[in-house]
Interface confidence: low
């Protein structure tokens, strides 16, 4: 979690002098309670927006918007504390709107916005707006909270953000899997326009339980420029056990921008439905998955480099 450093955030508006300050997330009114406190925010809305940094990078940001209730408590409203909590890490970041003038009722409802919290792909946040001063102990709460889920890098707008592009979001490998004779599986995918090595990881499971019964890793060496966007093929020899038939295939790139932390693409191949005539055929009903960057199969030095097939169809 961080704040955009450009442009400087603004909370002043017509009829209100205001400044945005960094906050420790512990407003003074928690420690020194006041007798008269304002009511809670109304209609808190969180939306995904996108912002450019001075360096030209594009980042997802949380756009926070809320309005004030039309009651007399606005006379005691001294500001607001905005808090964003990243749920998987418990990391919290806060800013404070400090009102430098008294609010007065006017012909339209007071509305506030803030769009400077930079968020990460595929993360969930709890956004809280606390009106200040905070209430006395056992007083009515004067905050409103909402959860906000940031889409992953498969989302069209997210795909072109700096954190997603850095992890390889623009590459679509279009993985296909084909079962062959003699316990073999052929994996094909489209190479990206970078001379980078790839790994193809196969893990097989039994149909009846989630029991891993076979795994192998194969290396594809960095393609030459003329091979960019071509199809690469890797053929795996599968376990001889017929019950070891549920296959999970991952393609892991090593792009220079993310090295070992690139987004992986995966497909699963279910066990075949047993029928009278079982003819090997392309698997059409695999389930495409978008794997997170971290995973249990990070780069191993003992991958099976010797038996990798690297064919290109021109």
């Amino acid at each position: 979690l961080r704040l955009l450093d450009f442009p400087a955030p603004v909370c002043a508006q017509e009829g209100l002098s205001c400044r945005v300050k960094n906050s420790t997330c512990l407003d003074d009114s928690w420690i020194h309670p006041r007798n008269l406190t304002p009511s809670s925010p109304k209609d808190l809305q969180i939306q995904l927006h996108f912002a450019h940094t001075q360096q030209g990078d594009l980042f997802p940001v949380a756009h926070i918007e809320w309005t004030l209730q039309t009651d007399a408590s606005i006379l005691y409203l001294e500001g607001a504390e905005l808090s964003v909590l990243q749920l998987n890490t418990n990391e919290r970041l806060c800013v404070r709107f400090e009102f430098l003038s008294k609010l007065r009722h006017h012909h339209r409802r007071w509305r506030f916005t803030f769009s400077h919290f930079v968020v990460d792909p595929d993360q969930e946040y709890e956004v809280t707006v606390h009106h200040l001063p905070k209430p006395i102990p056992d007083g009515d709460p004067n905050h409103q909270s909402k959860n906000f889920l940031v889409p992953d890098c498969e989302h069209a707008r997210m795909k072109v953000t700096t954190p997603c592009m850095s992890s390889g979001s623009l590459w679509d490998p279009n993985i296909t899997v084909e079962t062959l004779e003699a316990h073999q599986l052929r994996v094909s995918f489209t190479l990206w326009n970078e001379s980078t090595p790839y790994q193809v990881l196969l893990e097989s499971f039994s149909d009846s339980e989630n029991h891993s019964c076979f795994d192998v890793v194969k290396q594809i060496f960095a393609p030459r420029q003329e091979e960019f966007h071509q199809r690469a093929n890797v053929t795996f020899t599968l376990s001889k056990f017929h019950w070891c038939c549920h296959h999970h295939v991952q393609v892991q790139p090593f792009f220079s921008s993310c090295l070992n932390d690139c987004l992986r693409h995966a497909v699963t191949v279910p066990c075949p439905v047993i029928s009278n005539t079982t003819v090997p055929k392309p698997v059409a009903d695999y389930i495409p998955l978008w794997e997170p960057r971290s995973g249990s199969s990070d780069y191993k030095d003992d991958d099976d480099k010797g038996s990798s097939h690297h064919h290109h169809h021109h």
């Epitope: 980042f59 850095s166 090595p197 090593f254 921008s257 971290s294």
Partner: antibody, heavy 118, light 107 residues
Framework: EVQLVESGGGLVQPGGSLRLSCAAS????????MNWVRQAPGKGLEWVSF????????YYADSVKGRFTISRDNAKNSLYLQMNSLRDEDTAVYYC???????????WGQGTTVTVSS | DIQMTQSPSSLSASVGDRVTITCRAS??????LAWYQQKPGKFPELLIY???TLQSGVPSRFSGSGSGTDFTLTISSLQPEDVATYYC?????????FGPGTKVDIK
């Protein structure tokens, strides 16, 4: 402004320990892998360690493997290098460095000096 | 592990001269190579990445070429401010080894 600031260097006896820190600002630290690189007095650059954005992948140079531990706290925008069983040859300026999208390391700290001597 | 070597280890040239530094990898590394400039008492600065791409803000007199095992850094017209040590570095796979450096000064 994109910035890396190292701290924690100092004088330590052989066999001792130090913990280096690198404070990052001006960019989304949690989106970037990070590296430690060192430079012994009058010598060239030596890559020391790498940690991926979410700590899922970690690498060390053979010369420090088993003695140094790289870690990060994305909540605090900080990178760390725990150095144990220090030797004379670990005396160097230690830099933290951010990989560039596309390759190389485009953001470096000013460095912190570690002196191992009895 | 892949070893990186640089030649020459040092050179002296006149202002305006064309200067060439070579870097060799013991195995192919495609174009996963960066060049850095380090002035005395300063931290290194990225000049070239992906073997031939000029880093933003770096003067155009610097250029890089090569792929696989042999790489070259060229300064087309040496300037007094180019006095420094130049390092190559591979980054295709760990360890992300640096070359031993080439010290450049003015005659």
């Amino acid at each position: 402004e994109v910035q890396l600031v190292e701290s924690g260097g100092g004088l330590v006896q052989p066999g001792g320990s130090l913990r280096l820190s690198c404070a990052a600002s001006g960019f989304t630290f949690s989106s970037y892998s990070m590296n430690w690189v060192r430079q012994a007095p009058g010598k060239g650059l030596e890559w020391v360690s790498f940690i991926s954005a979410r700590s899922s992948t970690i690498y060390y140079a053979d010369s420090v493997k088993g003695r140094f531990t790289i870690s990060r706290d994305n909540a605090k925008n900080s990178l760390y290098l725990q150095m144990n069983s220090l030797r004379d040859e670990d005396t160097a300026v230690y830099y933290c460095a951010r990989p560039k999208v596309g390759g190389g390391m485009d953001v470096w700290g000013q460095g912190t000096t570690v002196t191992v001597s009895s | 592990d892949i070893q990186m070597t640089q030649s020459p280890s040092s050179l002296s040239a006149s202002v305006g001269d064309r200067v060439t530094i070579t870097c060799r990898a013991s195995q192919g590394i495609s174009n996963y190579l960066a060049w850095y400039q380090q002035k005395p008492g300063k931290f290194p600065e990225l000049l070239i990445y992906a073997a031939s791409t000029l880093q933003s803000g770096v003067p155009s007199r610097f250029s890089g070429s090569g792929s696989g095992t042999d790489f070259t850094l060229t300064i087309s017209s040496l300037q007094p401010e180019d006095v420094a040590t130049y390092y190559c570095q591979k980054y295709n796979r760990a360890p992300f080894t640096f070359g031993p450096g080439t010290k450049v000064d003015i005659k």
